[in-house]
Interface confidence: low
Protein backbone atom coordinates (compact mmCIF):
# COMPACT_ATOMS: atom_id res chain seq x y z
CA UNK A 1 0.00 0.00 0.00
CA UNK A 2 1.07 3.54 -0.66
CA UNK A 3 3.35 4.96 1.95
CA UNK A 4 3.70 8.68 1.33
CA UNK A 5 6.30 10.96 2.87
CA UNK A 6 8.01 8.21 4.81
CA UNK A 7 11.50 9.00 3.55
CA UNK A 8 12.71 10.90 6.60
CA UNK A 9 16.41 10.97 5.70
CA UNK A 10 18.05 14.00 4.14
CA UNK A 11 18.18 12.45 0.69
CA UNK A 12 15.93 13.84 -1.99
CA UNK A 13 15.39 13.31 -5.70
CA UNK A 14 16.42 15.55 -8.56
CA UNK A 15 13.64 16.51 -10.91
CA UNK A 16 12.25 17.00 -14.39
CA UNK A 17 14.11 20.25 -15.00
CA UNK A 18 17.52 19.64 -13.42
CA UNK A 19 19.17 22.50 -15.31
CA UNK A 20 16.59 25.17 -14.43
CA UNK A 21 18.43 28.27 -13.23
CA UNK A 22 21.82 26.59 -13.46
CA UNK A 23 23.94 28.66 -15.83
CA UNK A 24 27.63 29.46 -15.63
CA UNK A 25 27.02 33.20 -15.97
CA UNK A 26 24.65 33.07 -12.98
CA UNK A 27 27.33 31.35 -10.90
CA UNK A 28 29.73 34.21 -11.69
CA UNK A 29 27.48 37.26 -11.98
CA UNK A 30 25.32 36.73 -8.87
CA UNK A 31 28.18 36.19 -6.38
CA UNK A 32 29.83 39.31 -7.84
CA UNK A 33 26.65 41.35 -7.38
CA UNK A 34 26.15 39.95 -3.87
CA UNK A 35 29.70 40.99 -3.00
CA UNK A 36 29.08 44.54 -4.26
CA UNK A 37 25.80 44.74 -2.32
CA UNK A 38 27.60 43.44 0.78
CA UNK A 39 30.41 46.03 0.64
CA UNK A 40 28.19 48.99 -0.26
CA UNK A 41 25.43 47.91 2.11
CA UNK A 42 27.64 47.29 5.16
CA UNK A 43 29.47 50.58 4.61
CA UNK A 44 26.34 52.66 3.95
CA UNK A 45 24.11 51.17 6.63
CA UNK A 46 26.84 51.24 9.29
CA UNK A 47 27.32 54.95 8.61
CA UNK A 48 23.54 55.48 8.77
CA UNK A 49 23.46 53.79 12.21
CA UNK A 50 26.38 55.91 13.44
CA UNK A 51 24.90 59.16 12.09
CA UNK A 52 21.40 58.58 13.47
CA UNK A 53 22.44 57.11 16.81
CA UNK A 54 25.61 59.04 17.69
CA UNK A 55 25.33 62.30 15.76
CA UNK A 56 21.60 62.90 15.70
CA UNK A 57 20.96 61.25 19.07
CA UNK A 58 17.85 59.36 17.88
CA UNK A 59 15.43 62.18 18.61
CA UNK A 60 12.60 61.75 16.12
CA UNK A 61 10.01 59.17 15.14
CA UNK A 62 11.39 58.85 11.62
CA UNK A 63 14.96 58.47 12.88
CA UNK A 64 13.78 55.48 14.96
CA UNK A 65 12.29 53.88 11.83
CA UNK A 66 15.38 54.66 9.74
CA UNK A 67 17.71 53.28 12.40
CA UNK A 68 15.70 50.05 12.52
CA UNK A 69 15.66 49.93 8.72
CA UNK A 70 19.47 50.15 8.68
CA UNK A 71 19.77 47.51 11.43
CA UNK A 72 17.44 45.13 9.54
CA UNK A 73 19.58 45.64 6.42
CA UNK A 74 22.77 44.91 8.38
CA UNK A 75 21.27 41.66 9.73
CA UNK A 76 20.56 40.56 6.16
CA UNK A 77 23.88 41.78 4.77
CA UNK A 78 25.85 39.68 7.26
CA UNK A 79 24.43 36.51 5.67
CA UNK A 80 25.02 37.68 2.09
CA UNK A 81 28.55 36.19 1.81
CA UNK A 82 27.00 32.76 2.53
CA UNK A 83 24.60 33.17 -0.41
CA UNK A 84 27.46 34.40 -2.60
CA UNK A 85 29.48 31.25 -1.83
CA UNK A 86 26.37 29.06 -2.26
CA UNK A 87 25.72 30.48 -5.75
CA UNK A 88 29.40 30.44 -6.72
CA UNK A 89 29.50 26.76 -5.75
CA UNK A 90 26.58 26.11 -8.12
CA UNK A 91 23.98 25.85 -5.36
CA UNK A 92 26.01 23.62 -3.08
CA UNK A 93 25.62 24.52 0.60
CA UNK A 94 28.79 23.89 2.64
CA UNK A 95 27.79 25.71 5.84
CA UNK A 96 25.57 23.16 7.58
CA UNK A 97 21.92 23.05 8.59
CA UNK A 98 22.02 25.70 11.32
CA UNK A 99 23.43 28.44 9.05
CA UNK A 100 21.05 27.33 6.28
CA UNK A 101 18.10 28.12 8.56
CA UNK A 102 19.58 31.37 9.92
CA UNK A 103 20.58 32.73 6.49
CA UNK A 104 17.19 31.83 4.99
CA UNK A 105 15.31 33.42 7.87
CA UNK A 106 17.48 36.54 7.54
CA UNK A 107 16.42 37.05 3.90
CA UNK A 108 12.73 36.65 4.79
CA UNK A 109 13.09 38.80 7.92
CA UNK A 110 14.71 41.65 6.01
CA UNK A 111 11.98 41.64 3.37
CA UNK A 112 9.16 41.97 5.88
CA UNK A 113 10.95 44.22 8.38
CA UNK A 114 12.07 46.74 5.76
CA UNK A 115 8.74 46.81 3.94
CA UNK A 116 6.80 47.23 7.21
CA UNK A 117 9.20 49.96 8.39
CA UNK A 118 8.85 51.87 5.10
CA UNK A 119 5.07 51.56 5.43
CA UNK A 120 5.17 52.96 8.97
CA UNK A 121 7.50 55.72 7.79
CA UNK A 122 4.97 56.70 5.12
CA UNK A 123 2.14 56.75 7.70
CA UNK A 124 4.34 58.88 9.98
CA UNK A 125 5.02 61.30 7.10
CA UNK A 126 1.29 61.51 6.40
CA UNK A 127 0.49 62.31 10.05
CA UNK A 128 3.37 64.79 10.35
CA UNK A 129 2.47 66.74 7.23
CA UNK A 130 -1.29 66.46 6.90
CA UNK A 131 -2.20 66.36 10.61
CA UNK A 132 0.78 67.90 12.43
CA UNK A 133 -1.20 69.14 15.42
CA UNK A 134 -3.67 66.28 15.78
CA UNK A 135 -0.98 63.60 15.52
CA UNK A 136 1.45 65.18 17.98
CA UNK A 137 0.37 63.00 20.90
CA UNK A 138 0.43 59.86 18.78
CA UNK A 139 3.77 60.49 17.12
CA UNK A 140 5.93 59.98 20.19
CA UNK A 141 9.26 58.21 20.60
CA UNK A 142 7.58 55.57 22.75
CA UNK A 143 4.99 54.81 20.05
CA UNK A 144 7.76 54.64 17.43
CA UNK A 145 9.85 52.23 19.52
CA UNK A 146 6.85 50.00 20.36
CA UNK A 147 5.90 50.01 16.66
CA UNK A 148 9.43 48.86 15.77
CA UNK A 149 9.28 46.07 18.35
CA UNK A 150 5.95 44.92 16.85
CA UNK A 151 7.47 45.07 13.34
CA UNK A 152 10.46 42.96 14.41
CA UNK A 153 8.12 40.44 16.02
CA UNK A 154 5.89 40.28 12.92
CA UNK A 155 8.92 39.95 10.62
CA UNK A 156 10.24 37.23 12.94
CA UNK A 157 6.91 35.45 12.74
CA UNK A 158 6.95 35.68 8.94
CA UNK A 159 10.45 34.16 8.98
CA UNK A 160 9.46 31.14 11.10
CA UNK A 161 8.64 28.94 8.07
CA UNK A 162 12.23 29.41 6.87
CA UNK A 163 13.60 28.38 10.26
CA UNK A 164 11.29 25.36 10.46
CA UNK A 165 11.22 24.14 6.86
CA UNK A 166 14.57 25.18 5.38
CA UNK A 167 17.05 22.33 5.60
CA UNK A 168 20.21 20.99 4.05
CA UNK A 169 19.56 18.08 1.68
CA UNK A 170 21.80 15.76 -0.24
CA UNK A 171 20.40 15.20 -3.72
CA UNK A 172 21.20 11.60 -4.50
CA UNK A 173 21.69 11.36 -8.22
CA UNK A 174 23.46 14.69 -8.63
CA UNK A 175 25.60 14.66 -5.47
CA UNK A 176 24.61 18.21 -4.56
CA UNK A 177 24.00 19.41 -1.01
CA UNK A 178 21.41 22.20 -1.12
CA UNK A 179 19.86 24.59 1.37
CA UNK A 180 16.21 24.44 0.40
CA UNK A 181 12.59 24.22 1.46
CA UNK A 182 11.10 20.75 1.53
CA UNK A 183 7.50 19.73 1.63
CA UNK A 184 5.35 16.81 0.60
CA UNK A 185 4.72 16.57 -3.12
CA UNK A 186 1.02 16.04 -2.61
CA UNK A 187 0.82 19.03 -0.29
CA UNK A 188 2.23 22.16 -1.89
CA UNK A 189 0.36 24.54 0.43
CA UNK A 190 3.61 25.64 2.10
CA UNK A 191 5.40 27.06 -0.99
CA UNK A 192 2.17 28.48 -2.35
CA UNK A 193 1.30 30.02 1.02
CA UNK A 194 4.79 31.49 1.44
CA UNK A 195 4.80 32.89 -2.08
CA UNK A 196 1.36 34.47 -1.81
CA UNK A 197 2.14 35.82 1.68
CA UNK A 198 5.24 37.47 0.21
CA UNK A 199 3.12 38.91 -2.62
CA UNK A 200 0.25 40.16 -0.48
CA UNK A 201 1.70 40.90 2.96
CA UNK A 202 5.20 41.72 1.74
CA UNK A 203 4.24 43.92 -1.18
CA UNK A 204 0.61 44.52 -2.15
CA UNK A 205 -0.78 45.79 1.18
CA UNK A 206 2.32 47.83 2.10
CA UNK A 207 2.47 49.35 -1.38
CA UNK A 208 -1.20 50.36 -1.22
CA UNK A 209 -0.62 52.01 2.19
CA UNK A 210 2.55 53.79 0.96
CA UNK A 211 0.77 54.91 -2.20
CA UNK A 212 -2.25 56.15 -0.21
CA UNK A 213 -0.07 57.98 2.34
CA UNK A 214 1.99 59.82 -0.26
CA UNK A 215 -1.06 60.52 -2.45
CA UNK A 216 -2.76 62.19 0.53
CA UNK A 217 0.44 64.14 1.27
CA UNK A 218 0.59 65.18 -2.39
CA UNK A 219 -3.04 66.35 -2.31
CA UNK A 220 -2.58 68.25 0.95
CA UNK A 221 0.51 70.04 -0.36
CA UNK A 222 -1.17 70.80 -3.68
CA UNK A 223 -4.09 72.33 -1.77
CA UNK A 224 -1.68 74.40 0.33
CA UNK A 225 0.05 75.70 -2.80
CA UNK A 226 -3.29 76.58 -4.40
CA UNK A 227 -4.24 78.62 -1.32
CA UNK A 228 -1.05 80.64 -1.73
CA UNK A 229 -1.06 81.20 -5.48
CA UNK A 230 1.16 84.23 -5.16
CA UNK A 231 4.02 82.21 -3.66
CA UNK A 232 6.54 80.36 -5.87
CA UNK A 233 5.79 76.65 -6.07
CA UNK A 234 8.49 74.20 -4.99
CA UNK A 235 8.18 71.18 -7.30
CA UNK A 236 11.02 69.31 -5.58
CA UNK A 237 8.69 67.92 -2.95
CA UNK A 238 6.44 66.35 -5.60
CA UNK A 239 9.47 64.85 -7.35
CA UNK A 240 10.62 63.37 -4.05
CA UNK A 241 7.18 61.88 -3.34
CA UNK A 242 7.18 60.32 -6.82
CA UNK A 243 10.73 59.05 -6.28
CA UNK A 244 9.83 57.41 -2.94
CA UNK A 245 6.79 55.59 -4.35
CA UNK A 246 8.43 54.58 -7.64
CA UNK A 247 11.68 53.52 -5.95
CA UNK A 248 9.75 51.16 -3.68
CA UNK A 249 7.57 49.87 -6.51
CA UNK A 250 10.32 49.20 -9.05
CA UNK A 251 12.67 47.75 -6.42
CA UNK A 252 10.24 45.02 -5.45
CA UNK A 253 7.99 44.43 -8.47
CA UNK A 254 10.43 42.18 -10.42
CA UNK A 255 10.98 39.92 -7.40
CA UNK A 256 7.26 39.85 -6.62
CA UNK A 257 6.34 38.97 -10.23
CA UNK A 258 8.79 36.07 -10.31
CA UNK A 259 7.66 34.94 -6.86
CA UNK A 260 4.12 34.79 -8.24
CA UNK A 261 5.31 32.85 -11.32
CA UNK A 262 7.06 30.51 -8.90
CA UNK A 263 3.71 29.94 -7.15
CA UNK A 264 2.10 29.13 -10.52
CA UNK A 265 4.85 26.57 -11.13
CA UNK A 266 4.28 25.02 -7.70
CA UNK A 267 0.55 24.81 -8.44
CA UNK A 268 1.32 23.05 -11.72
CA UNK A 269 -0.40 25.80 -13.71
CA UNK A 270 2.91 26.47 -15.47
CA UNK A 271 4.43 23.17 -16.61
CA UNK A 272 7.15 24.27 -18.95
CA UNK A 273 10.85 23.71 -18.22
CA UNK A 274 11.78 26.80 -20.25
CA UNK A 275 9.61 29.02 -18.04
CA UNK A 276 10.97 27.27 -14.94
CA UNK A 277 14.46 28.02 -16.23
CA UNK A 278 13.59 31.69 -16.80
CA UNK A 279 12.08 31.95 -13.29
CA UNK A 280 15.00 30.20 -11.58
CA UNK A 281 17.52 32.25 -13.55
CA UNK A 282 15.75 35.55 -12.97
CA UNK A 283 15.04 34.96 -9.27
CA UNK A 284 18.56 35.68 -7.97
CA UNK A 285 18.77 38.71 -10.30
CA UNK A 286 15.50 40.11 -8.91
CA UNK A 287 16.81 39.43 -5.40
CA UNK A 288 19.87 41.54 -6.26
CA UNK A 289 17.68 44.41 -7.48
CA UNK A 290 15.28 44.28 -4.53
CA UNK A 291 17.82 43.86 -1.77
CA UNK A 292 20.37 46.27 -3.20
CA UNK A 293 17.73 48.99 -3.41
CA UNK A 294 16.52 47.93 0.01
CA UNK A 295 19.99 48.42 1.45
CA UNK A 296 20.17 51.85 -0.16
CA UNK A 297 16.88 52.89 1.45
CA UNK A 298 18.34 54.32 4.71
CA UNK A 299 20.76 56.40 2.62
CA UNK A 300 18.04 57.39 0.17
CA UNK A 301 15.63 58.48 2.90
CA UNK A 302 18.36 59.97 5.07
CA UNK A 303 19.86 62.10 2.33
CA UNK A 304 16.52 63.81 1.86
CA UNK A 305 17.36 65.62 5.09
CA UNK A 306 19.90 68.45 5.21
CA UNK A 307 21.08 67.62 8.74
CA UNK A 308 21.51 63.95 7.97
CA UNK A 309 23.51 64.83 4.86
CA UNK A 310 25.69 67.22 6.84
CA UNK A 311 26.42 64.72 9.63
CA UNK A 312 26.98 61.92 7.13
CA UNK A 313 29.62 63.95 5.25
CA UNK A 314 31.04 65.05 8.59
CA UNK A 315 31.44 61.41 9.58
CA UNK A 316 33.19 60.62 6.30
CA UNK A 317 35.71 63.32 7.20
CA UNK A 318 36.23 61.64 10.61
CA UNK A 319 34.73 64.51 12.58
CA UNK A 320 33.43 63.02 15.86
CA UNK A 321 29.93 63.86 17.15
CA UNK A 322 29.57 66.54 19.80
CA UNK A 323 29.38 65.07 23.29
CA UNK A 324 26.47 67.35 24.15
CA UNK A 325 23.03 66.57 22.77
CA UNK A 326 22.03 68.79 19.85
CA UNK A 327 19.71 71.42 21.20
CA UNK A 328 18.40 72.36 17.78
CA UNK A 329 17.16 68.86 17.05
CA UNK A 330 13.46 69.08 17.66
CA UNK A 331 11.37 65.94 18.13
CA UNK A 332 8.75 66.92 15.66
CA UNK A 333 9.75 65.76 12.21
CA UNK A 334 11.78 63.68 9.86
CA UNK A 335 11.87 62.82 6.21
CA UNK A 336 9.30 64.76 4.26
CA UNK A 337 8.66 67.09 7.17
CA UNK A 338 6.96 70.31 8.01
CA UNK A 339 7.67 72.66 10.82
CA UNK A 340 4.88 72.15 13.39
CA UNK A 341 3.64 75.66 12.71
CA UNK A 342 3.36 74.94 9.01
CA UNK A 343 -0.02 73.27 9.13
CA UNK A 344 -0.94 72.68 5.50
CA UNK A 345 -4.48 73.87 6.06
CA UNK A 346 -3.22 77.27 7.18
CA UNK A 347 -3.52 79.92 4.53
CA UNK A 348 -1.39 82.42 6.39
CA UNK A 349 1.83 80.46 6.19
CA UNK A 350 3.85 79.40 3.20
CA UNK A 351 4.24 75.63 3.12
CA UNK A 352 7.96 75.08 3.54
CA UNK A 353 8.44 71.36 3.25
CA UNK A 354 11.87 70.13 4.09
CA UNK A 355 12.88 66.51 3.90
CA UNK A 356 14.64 66.08 7.18
CA UNK A 357 15.46 63.29 9.55
CA UNK A 358 15.79 65.94 12.20
Amino acid sequence: ILNSSTEDGIKRIQDDCPKAGRHNYIFVMIPTLYSIIFVVGIFGNSLVVIVIYFYMKLKTVASVFLLNLALADLCFLLTLPLWAVYTAMEYRWPFGNYLCKIASASVSFNLYASVFLLTCLSIDRYLAIVHPMKSRLRRTMLVAKVTCIIIWLLAGLASLPAIIHRNVFFIENTNITVCAFHYESQNSTLPIGLGLTKNILGFLFPFLIILTSYTLIWKALKKAYEIQKNKPRNDDIFKIIMAIVLFFFFSWIPHQIFTFLDVLIQLGIIRDCRIADIVDTAMPITICIAYFNNCLNPLFYGFLGKKFKRYFLQLLKYIPPKAKSHSNLSTKMSTLSYRPSDNVSSSTKKPAPCFEVE
Epitope: E7, D16, G268, A276
Partner: nanobody, 122 residues
Framework: QVQLQESGGGLVQAGGSLRLSCAAS????????MGWYRQAPGKEREFVAG???????NYADSVKGRFTISRDNAKNTVYLQMNSLKPEDTAVYYC????????????????WGQGTQVTVSS
Protein backbone atom coordinates in the same frame (compact mmCIF):
# COMPACT_ATOMS: atom_id res chain seq x y z
CA GLN B 1 -6.22 1.95 -2.30
CA VAL B 2 -2.96 0.67 -3.82
CA GLN B 3 -1.44 3.57 -5.75
CA LEU B 4 1.94 2.04 -6.68
CA GLN B 5 2.32 -1.70 -7.28
CA GLU B 6 5.60 -3.33 -8.31
CA SER B 7 5.94 -6.70 -10.00
CA GLY B 8 8.51 -8.69 -12.02
CA GLY B 9 11.09 -9.40 -9.34
CA GLY B 10 12.66 -12.81 -8.85
CA LEU B 11 15.80 -14.91 -8.94
CA VAL B 12 18.09 -14.58 -11.95
CA GLN B 13 21.61 -15.68 -12.88
CA ALA B 14 24.43 -13.13 -13.28
CA GLY B 15 24.40 -11.72 -16.81
CA GLY B 16 20.69 -12.39 -17.12
CA SER B 17 17.77 -9.99 -17.56
CA LEU B 18 14.60 -9.01 -15.72
CA ARG B 19 11.84 -6.52 -16.36
CA LEU B 20 10.20 -4.78 -13.41
CA SER B 21 6.80 -3.16 -13.75
CA CYS B 22 5.19 -0.47 -11.64
CA ALA B 23 1.49 0.18 -12.07
CA ALA B 24 0.39 3.57 -10.77
CA SER B 25 -3.02 5.09 -10.10
CA UNK B 26 -4.12 7.53 -12.77
CA UNK B 27 -3.81 10.51 -10.41
CA UNK B 28 -0.17 9.76 -9.54
CA UNK B 29 0.86 8.67 -13.02
CA UNK B 30 -0.31 11.89 -14.66
CA UNK B 31 1.17 14.24 -12.05
CA UNK B 32 4.38 12.70 -10.79
CA UNK B 33 7.79 11.81 -12.02
CA MET B 34 8.30 8.04 -11.71
CA GLY B 35 11.46 6.29 -10.66
CA TRP B 36 13.10 3.21 -9.23
CA TYR B 37 15.11 2.92 -6.04
CA ARG B 38 16.75 -0.09 -4.50
CA GLN B 39 17.87 -1.17 -1.06
CA ALA B 40 20.38 -3.95 -0.53
CA PRO B 41 20.50 -5.67 2.90
CA GLY B 42 22.27 -3.46 5.45
CA LYS B 43 22.60 -0.58 2.96
CA GLU B 44 20.80 2.71 2.40
CA ARG B 45 18.12 3.07 -0.21
CA GLU B 46 19.70 4.33 -3.43
CA PHE B 47 18.45 5.93 -6.62
CA VAL B 48 18.43 3.70 -9.72
CA ALA B 49 16.55 5.48 -12.51
CA GLY B 50 13.88 8.10 -13.08
CA UNK B 51 11.56 9.19 -15.87
CA UNK B 52 9.65 12.46 -16.11
CA UNK B 53 6.17 13.09 -17.43
CA UNK B 54 7.94 14.56 -20.43
CA UNK B 55 9.94 11.27 -20.75
CA UNK B 56 13.23 12.82 -19.60
CA UNK B 57 15.26 10.01 -18.03
CA ASN B 58 18.20 9.83 -15.66
CA TYR B 59 20.18 6.95 -14.24
CA ALA B 60 22.58 6.18 -11.41
CA ASP B 61 26.14 5.77 -12.73
CA SER B 62 26.24 2.15 -11.55
CA VAL B 63 23.39 1.10 -13.90
CA LYS B 64 23.97 3.34 -16.93
CA GLY B 65 24.06 1.33 -20.15
CA ARG B 66 22.57 -1.77 -18.48
CA PHE B 67 19.17 -0.59 -17.22
CA THR B 68 16.47 1.21 -19.20
CA ILE B 69 13.45 2.99 -17.74
CA SER B 70 10.35 3.54 -19.84
CA ARG B 71 6.67 4.33 -19.38
CA ASP B 72 3.49 3.13 -21.04
CA ASN B 73 0.94 5.93 -20.82
CA ALA B 74 -1.94 3.72 -21.95
CA LYS B 75 -1.39 1.38 -19.00
CA ASN B 76 -0.18 3.95 -16.43
CA THR B 77 2.85 1.71 -15.98
CA VAL B 78 6.57 2.34 -15.65
CA TYR B 79 9.09 -0.37 -16.56
CA LEU B 80 12.68 -1.02 -15.59
CA GLN B 81 14.43 -3.26 -18.08
CA MET B 82 17.50 -4.72 -16.34
CA ASN B 83 20.15 -6.36 -18.53
CA SER B 84 23.63 -7.75 -17.72
CA LEU B 85 22.65 -8.18 -14.09
CA LYS B 86 25.40 -8.47 -11.49
CA PRO B 87 25.31 -9.98 -7.97
CA GLU B 88 25.66 -6.46 -6.57
CA ASP B 89 22.28 -5.62 -8.16
CA THR B 90 20.63 -7.87 -5.57
CA ALA B 91 18.20 -5.70 -3.58
CA VAL B 92 14.57 -4.87 -2.92
CA TYR B 93 13.52 -2.60 -5.78
CA TYR B 94 11.03 0.14 -4.96
CA CYS B 95 8.91 2.07 -7.37
CA UNK B 96 8.74 5.77 -6.45
CA UNK B 97 6.53 8.65 -7.56
CA UNK B 98 7.85 12.09 -6.87
CA UNK B 99 6.60 15.55 -7.62
CA UNK B 100 5.41 16.30 -11.12
CA UNK B 101 7.15 19.63 -11.43
CA UNK B 102 9.62 20.80 -8.89
CA UNK B 103 12.78 22.46 -10.12
CA UNK B 104 16.47 22.44 -9.43
CA UNK B 105 16.44 24.21 -6.09
CA UNK B 106 13.27 22.78 -4.54
CA UNK B 107 12.90 19.15 -3.54
CA UNK B 108 10.05 16.97 -2.40
CA UNK B 109 9.09 13.85 -0.49
CA UNK B 110 7.98 10.82 -2.46
CA UNK B 111 5.35 8.10 -2.69
CA TRP B 112 6.77 4.60 -2.32
CA GLY B 113 5.57 1.20 -3.44
CA GLN B 114 6.02 -1.89 -1.23
CA GLY B 115 9.02 -3.18 -3.16
CA THR B 116 9.88 -6.29 -5.15
CA GLN B 117 12.86 -8.59 -4.43
CA VAL B 118 15.51 -9.07 -7.11
CA THR B 119 18.18 -11.67 -6.41
CA VAL B 120 21.13 -12.14 -8.77
CA SER B 121 23.09 -15.33 -8.14
CA SER B 122 26.64 -15.82 -9.27
Amino acid sequence: QVQLQESGGGLVQAGGSLRLSCAASDYIYRRYRMGWYRQAPGKEREFVAGIGVGTTTNYADSVKGRFTISRDNAKNTVYLQMNSLKPEDTAVYYCAAYNYFPRSIVYYYVYWGQGTQVTVSS
